[in-house]
Amino acid sequence: MSSKYPRSVRRCLPLWALTLEAALILLFYFFTHYDASLEDQKGLVASYQVGQDLTVMAAIGLGFLTSSFRRHSWSSVAFNLFMLALGVQWAILLDGFLSQFPSGKVVITLFSIRLATMSALSVLISVDAVLGKVNLAQLVVMVLVEVTALGNLRMVISNIFNTDYHMNMMHIYVFAAYFGLSVAWCLPKPLPEGTEDKDQTATIPSLSAMLGALFLWMFWPSFNSALLRSPIERKNAVFNTYYAVAVSVVTAISGSSLAHPQGKISKTYVHSAVLAGGVAVGTSCHLIPSPWLAMVLGLVAGLISVGGAKYLPGCCNRVLGIPHSSIMGYNFSLLGLLGEIIYIVLLVLDTVGAGNGMIGFQVLLSIGELSLAIVIALMSGLLTGLLLNLKIWKAPHEAKYFDDQVFWKFPHLAVGF
């Protein structure tokens, strides 16, 4: 007999999600309004295009990138969309409350939508580590906690460490990775006998995951430059990100072949490593002065990513119960750290060159920021993991992990797959 959506979740999910949506609508009604000031339409369209790029990255890029499981591809794509839609709404409100609220109502601009989309992207990166082991009701909790934690982290970093939008948002890679890994650590790990095939990848879903990787690859320059302050910084960020991801693709494919005894190319390595350069240059993409430096970083990031994809999944699978094809968690944790370290190295080089106390002070601040991001990610991730383990959410049984049929109606399937 085909698996049915558990009765209790059927009662719990619509009630939980629709009540939450109603609450969000009320919050928007009482506390928000649109920015009504005069602006020319050309400028609005240009500003919207950046937001559109980010939405494509989130919905198609990350949606499809996580869809490589043989029996969990539908859920991966649709649950991603659900989380994105919910996350953007909550992120707009939260950012408004944290930054504008004392002055009255929250003003919604295209920039605030852009910011909210990037905050929601954090959840889509994290969820890769737990997708297939949780239901939608649990994902709603994860969205709310993670967006709230990231919003507060950004506000704290902005106020204490005096950083701008770009710098405090670029902690997203490290934050999302460690948040996802700590949530995964809390969830039931072992796959019961007979279900191991479900977390294997299949050709068509793997192709759609590659499609997701391509969308991310194309739009990563938009992501890295979206929050920068001036055209000159944005242009530099776009160029450097493009060079870095271009080199990381070449490195990923060559490195993947090199890592295999028969010289074969691994799909999982490529999905992962094509993005490596973009993540690694994220924090300092606007600061890198010449293409060759961005390319070197792309090369290093590609090698680290392939190396990580070869040696880390075994460890992640044993300790955290993360399937081999869920590469984003460990990939972003390594590459996000690399990106942060590159930025700190730039500041250290400044200190050595200038002997300026101001710059030495900034090195300490940057190390403090990174440490805080990791600590808050781990703590909020563990809290989320503990919340998701509560019986109230009726989590799928381990035997039903990585199974679309638990959640979806397939009229043409009378019995299992």
Partner: antibody, heavy 129, light 108 residues
Framework: EVQLVETGGGVVQPGRSLRLSCAAS????????MHWVRQAPGKGLEWVAV????????YYADSVKGRFTISRDNSKNTLYLQMNSLRAEDTAVYYC??????????????????????WGKGTTVTVSS | SSELTQDPAVSVTLGQTVRITCQGD??????ASWYQQKPGQAPILVIY???IRPSGIPDRFSGSTSGNTASLTITGAQAEDGGDYYC???????????FGDGTRVTVV
């Protein structure tokens, strides 16, 4: 020649509104952030507001937040400052200024600098009953 | 919002060197810009960044930063250097700009 010309100043009663304009010429207006800065009689400069080059973000000094609105029309090369609920302490010469983002580079990184490199001559706003 | 503190007034003999200071927490994070304003005129940018002069500004103007203090030095002051000098910095996190109270420089 790079030029900024402010208009719209005048005498207004407390609580009333006024709209200042700043016409830009001689440069690509849509590529620059823009500021309003004011100077009360016999006092120093006070930053009022900034708007990003594409109009996507606006920031205000605490003293004018909720009362003043900065906006721009890139198709008309014009910057605006809508001033509502005016008070006596808003009496000042209002300057619009172009934000220049310049950089210098070492072999390994760029350094960005933000400042106001071009200023208008100013327009006088007097709030008095 | 962060504040920048300047000495109200300094006097300098023609041809001598004068140093104007500006103090504030925001200067730990970003460099100061310096503006010169003469009576009835709009301000003019004279120094920004580590020690960068816009074109048209004489090389007798120089800037430096140490900790939370920025300095503007006029080496060999000329009569036309008299006026009000304002330091300015940008708070990176809030994108708010702040001006110092200004220092009146008199060349005698």
């Amino acid at each position: 020649e790079v030029q900024l010309v402010e208009t719209g100043g005048g005498v207004v009663q407390p609580g009333r509104s006024l709209r200042l304009s700043c016409a830009a010429s001689g440069f690509t207006f849509s590529s620059y952030g823009m500021h309003w800065v004011r100077q009360a009689p016999g006092k120093g400069l006070e930053w009022v507001a900034v708007i990003w080059y594409d109009g996507s973000n606006k920031y205000y000094a605490d003293s004018v937040k909720g009362r003043f609105t900065i906006s721009r029309d890139n198709s008309k090369n014009t910057l605006y400052l809508q001033m509502n609920s005016l008070r006596a302490e808003d009496t000042a010469v209002y300057y619009c200024a172009r934000e220049m983002v310049s950089y210098s580079s070492s072999w390994y990184r760029r350094y960005y600098y933000y400042n106001m490199d071009v200023w208008g001559k100013g327009t006088t706003v007097t709030v008095s009953s | 919002s962060s504040e920048l503190t300047q000495d109200p007034a300094v006097s300098v003999t023609l041809g001598q060197t004068v140093r104007i200071t500006c103090q504030g927490d925001s200067l730990r994070h970003s460099y100061a810009s310096w503006y010169q304003q003469k009576p009835g005129q709009a301000p003019i940018l004279v120094i920004y960044g580590k020690n960068i002069r816009p074109s048209g500004i004489p090389d007798r103007f120089s800037g430096s930063t140490s900790g939370n203090t920025a300095s503007l030095t006029i080496t060999g002051a000329q009569a036309e250097d008299g006026g009000d000098y304002y330091c300015n910095s940008r708070d990176t996190s809030t994108d708010h700009y702040v001006f110092g109270d200004g220092t009146r420089v008199t060349v005698v």
